[in-house]
Amino acid sequence: FERTRSLQDPCSNCPAGTFCDNNRNQICSPCPPNSFSSAGGQRTCDICRQCKGVFRTRKECSSTSNAECDCTPGFHCLGAGCSMCEQDCKQGQELTKKGCKDCCFGTFNDQKRGICRPWTNCSLDGKSVLVNGTKERDVVCGPSPADLSPGASSVTPPAPAREPGHSPQ
């Protein structure tokens, strides 16, 4: 049945990298320059994506696959298949309509992209702040105040030693 279906649809016999050419009695012709078909049976080839401006070419277009873009230094990809490039900011900043702005007190961003996020509220987990937060780093939560009462140890016991030359199973 599969063979009969391909007989009935001459175009289905055209492999990736070609198209079913109605101007040549439906024989399979190669995709023209700067176009591609990633699947067989195509009646047209798709135009290759061009990585221009803030986009740069990560992978060249071929007859069977589209070009892939990424962003020039100082920018990062957004969206499926890097459909947009967004300006990088420094750690401790976020991108606004007016450009890169420092994170407000009580928030941080440890990446060059994205928004500033609130510091973790250690007390919600019944813990205390061990290391204060900054614009670039979240707070580090430590043991709860009760765990630090006299007689309580805040030191984690060491892990059991392994024999040298053996990796864990």
């Epitope: 007989l7 289905s12 016999n13 492999p15 439906q26 024989i27 399979c28």
Partner: antibody, heavy 115, light 107 residues
């Protein structure tokens, strides 16, 4: 321009063998289904066989056991190996490009089977 | 296998006249039918594919119609170069088969 040039025909005795060739140009041979069609003198057209770009084949059931189609994509050439030839195989043999639609044909090569 | 029967066997007409050639299939072949023209000493040439689509470079005086089992090739106004043998061919199922041909001759 699509061009198909058959060769290898001639006079052969009954029971003999012959290999026909079809040199293709003007299109992407390696991407296309290729066919052999024959025409006995003064008669109509009879489809013989086809081979896909990947090498899968299909035959007219009346000929399959004696005829073998093949292709060499690196040489842009189609072949038809004909064995155990009979007088009724006398015909002009055409190669043609296309799947279902035989869009372009060569001029044919005459095979005569006679003692 | 699918048998194609063409009629008439021979059609005698004059240039300028309209020609109607028929092809009947032994079972339903949808629109999987082609028409070819063959002149003496030449290879066949594809005229119509898919029952009604004109092949590359074919003048618009040639038209095809039909579906299922009954098909027609029409030449609206015969030119001297149109006198030839015409074959229909089905590609609904293997083996591919041809009709026996219709000879279009000058009256």
């Amino acid at each position: 321009e699509v061009q198909l040039l058959e060769s290898g025909g001639g006079l052969v005795q009954p029971g003999g063998s012959l290999r026909l060739s079809c040199a293709a140009s003007g299109f992407t041979f390696s991407s296309n289904v290729m066919n052999w069609v024959r025409q006995a003198p003064g008669k109509g057209l009879e489809w013989v066989s086809e081979i896909s770009h990947s090498g899968s084949t299909n035959y007219n059931p009346s000929l399959k056991s004696r005829f073998t189609i093949s292709r060499d994509n690196s040489k842009n050439t189609l072949y038809l190996q004909m064995n155990s030839l009979r007088a009724e195989d006398t015909a002009v043999y055409y190669c043609a490009v296309g799947a279902g639609n035989l869009g372009y044909w060569g001029q044919g090569t005459l095979v005569t089977v006679s003692s | 296998e699918i048998v194609l029967t063409q009629s008439p066997g021979t059609l005698s007409l004059s240039p300028g006249e309209r020609a109607t050639l028929s092809c009947q299939a032994s079972q339903d072949i949808s629109n999987y039918l082609n028409w070819y023209q063959q002149k003496p000493g030449q290879a066949p040439r594809l005229l119509i594919y898919g029952a009604s689509s004109r092949a590359t470079g074919i003048p618009d005086r040639f038209s095809g119609s039909g579906s299922g089992t009954d098909f027609t090739l029409t030449i609206s106004r015969l030119e001297p170069e149109d006198f030839a043998v015409y074959y229909c061919q089905q590609y609904n199922s293997y083996p591919i088969t041809f009709g026996q041909g219709t000879k279009l001759e000058i009256k």
